[in-house]
Interface confidence: medium
């Protein structure tokens, strides 16, 4: 590694990043007929153009606009599932409940899910050694700005009843500093969104508390109510049952006893 290369606190670009993005794009457009028109090479060029040769602490939402334009996608605005700190269950749920969508079920979310990337100022190289950490280095890094941009657009598109899955095992069930708390909540459009419904996912098998009464949930309710959006909350006491019982409620384990 050349000695002059900037060392950041976060992990470097995911190995085989260009190939991964291109392969994911091809796979997604094959599976989703409504996105068949997308030219994946152009998508990669737009993605690359957002961060290559730019200082990785000086990325803006404007840098991602060409990519946003190419990845424009219409999902049913009343079938949006947001999540915070519980991505795996949210994704399992939309696999079972095929007509609901997380951000990662859209093309742009699917392309970037679990990947890291950054470049270097004034060189066309991708930095595979390290990338800026949001806390330790800077918030305007390529990954953070990407997720802020797509999350804002996703929330802005939502309508009617919007659902959010929250992790009831965490000390802050609702965290104002999460992407959901800092971006999505503030970009739901009150003229389109009637209700935000939180699904609080319990961790412990014997946990029968009403986590909808948690102070952080009350804080979320307050924020949402001030934005003239109704708030609803439900406990999901057994996430394993939840997935299986939404589709097959007559299963013997789907009675209400915890």
């Amino acid at each position: 590694v050349p000695r002059w290369r900037q060392q950041w606190s976060g992990p470097g670009t995911t190995k085989r990043f260009p190939e991964t993005v291109l392969a994911r794009c091809v796979k997604y457009t094959e599976i989703h007929p409504e996105m068949r028109h997308v030219d994946c090479q152009s998508v990669w060029d737009a993605f690359k153009g957002a961060f290559i040769s730019k200082h990785p602490c000086n990325i803006t939402e404007e840098d991602y606009q060409p990519l946003m334009k190419l990845g424009t996608q219409t999902v049913p605005c009343n079938k949006i599932l947001l999540w915070s700190r519980i991505k795996d269950l949210a994704h399992q749920f939309t696999q079972v409940q095929r007509d609901m969508f997380t951000l990662e079920d859209t093309l742009l979310g699917y392309l970037a899910d679990d990947l890291t990337w950054c470049g270097e100022f004034n060189t066309s190289k991708i930095n595979y050694q390290s990338c800026p950490d949001w806390r330790k280095d800077c918030s305007n890094n390529p990954v953070s700005v990407f997720w802020k941009t797509v999350s804002r657009r996703f929330a802005e598109a939502a309508c009617d009843v919007v659902h959010v899955m929250l992790n009831g095992s965490r000390s802050k069930i609702f965290d104002k500093n999460s992407t959901f708390g800092s971006v999505e909540v503030h970009n739901l459009q009150p003229e389109k969104v009637q209700t935000l419904e939180a699904w609080v996912i319990h961790g412990g098998r014997e946990d029968s508390r009403d986590l909808c009464q948690d102070p952080t949930i009350k804080e979320l309710e307050s924020i949402i109510s001030k934005r003239n959006i109704q708030f609803s909350c439900k406990n999901i006491y057994r996430p394993d049952k939840f997935l299986q019982c939404v589709k097959n409620p007559e299963d013997s384990s789907c009675t209400s006893e915890i």
């Epitope: 419904e197 109704q230 439900k234 019982c245 939404v246 409620p249 009675t255 209400s256």
Partner: antibody, heavy 123, light 107 residues
Framework: QVQLVQSGAEVKKPGSSVKVSCKAS????????IGWVRQAPGQGLEWMGR????????HYAQKFQGRVTITADESTSTAYMELSSLRSEDTAVYYC????????????????WGQGTLVTVSS | EIVMTQSPATLSVSPGERATLSCRAS??????LAWYQQKPGQAPRLLIY???TRATGIPARFSGSGSGTEFTLTISSLQSEDFAVYYC?????????FGQGTKVEIK
């Protein structure tokens, strides 16, 4: 005011189908179920099935499986119950009701009821 | 399916008296039991859910108790508007099932 308003009475011939609608207004709770319950003249109540409109998830009582179809149009807040291959024993008042409970996917009781739709099956 | 049996079929009570209605499940339904009131030509109305919780707007003279297989609906002092048919419903096991009803009539 929270209410469910159902379509009007129907007279049908044996073997035909009937489709009853149930329009919701003022429902504040997002993920609720709309259940369908029928009551034959002078008889008790019988649960037929339900839909969770927000999830488009349906579930039917085994007795009616294959004959009943429950759908929902979220844009108009309307649920529908279609019963096919009608016979005289299907003459009943059909109610829609909102199901609420502590669990999203499973248990609920019916807290708000439509006014009922009388379906008469007669040749 | 769970069979819900209500007794008595008919209960004759004078206004101001206490009425006690019984509902028995063929197997345990925990506390997942509701009571409804139905007057002629009207839709049922929720009175009690969770075996003992009064629904919104239901007068305090209505109370529910029990869990498992034995449940009771008590109307402490019958008013003229309380004469109706009462149904219990279990929502613990599919399919949801109702009792056959108890008719409370004026003595």
């Amino acid at each position: 005011q929270v209410q469910l308003v159902q379509s009007g009475a129907e007279v049908k011939k044996p073997g035909s189908s009937v489709k009853v609608s149930c329009k919701a207004s003022g429902l504040p709770d997002a993920t609720y179920a709309i259940g369908w319950v029928r009551q034959a003249p002078g008889q008790g109540l019988e649960w037929m099935g339900r839909i969770i409109p927000a999830l488009a998830a349906t579930h039917y009582a085994q007795k009616f499986q294959g004959r009943v179809t429950i759908t929902a149009d979220e844009s108009t807040s309307t649920a529908y119950m279609e019963l096919s291959s009608l016979r005289s024993e299907d003459t009943a008042v059909y109610y829609c009701a909102r199901g609420l409970g502590y669990y999203l996917y499973s248990s609920y009781y019916f807290d708000i009821w439509g006014q009922g739709t009388l379906v008469t099956v007669s040749s | 399916e769970i069979v819900m049996t209500q007794s008595p079929a008919t209960l004759s009570v004078s206004p101001g008296e206490r009425a006690t209605l019984s509902c028995r499940a063929s197997q345990s339904v925990s506390s997942n039991l509701a009571w409804y009131q139905q007057k002629p030509g009207q839709a049922p109305r929720l009175l009690i859910y969770g075996a003992s919780t009064r629904a919104t707007g239901i007068p305090a003279r209505f109370s529910g108790s029990g869990s498992g297989t034995e449940f009771t609906l008590t109307i402490s002092s019958l008013q003229s508007e309380d004469f109706a048919v009462y149904y219990c419903q279990q929502y613990n096991n599919w399919p949801w099932t109702f009792g056959q009803g108890t008719k409370v009539e004026i003595k």
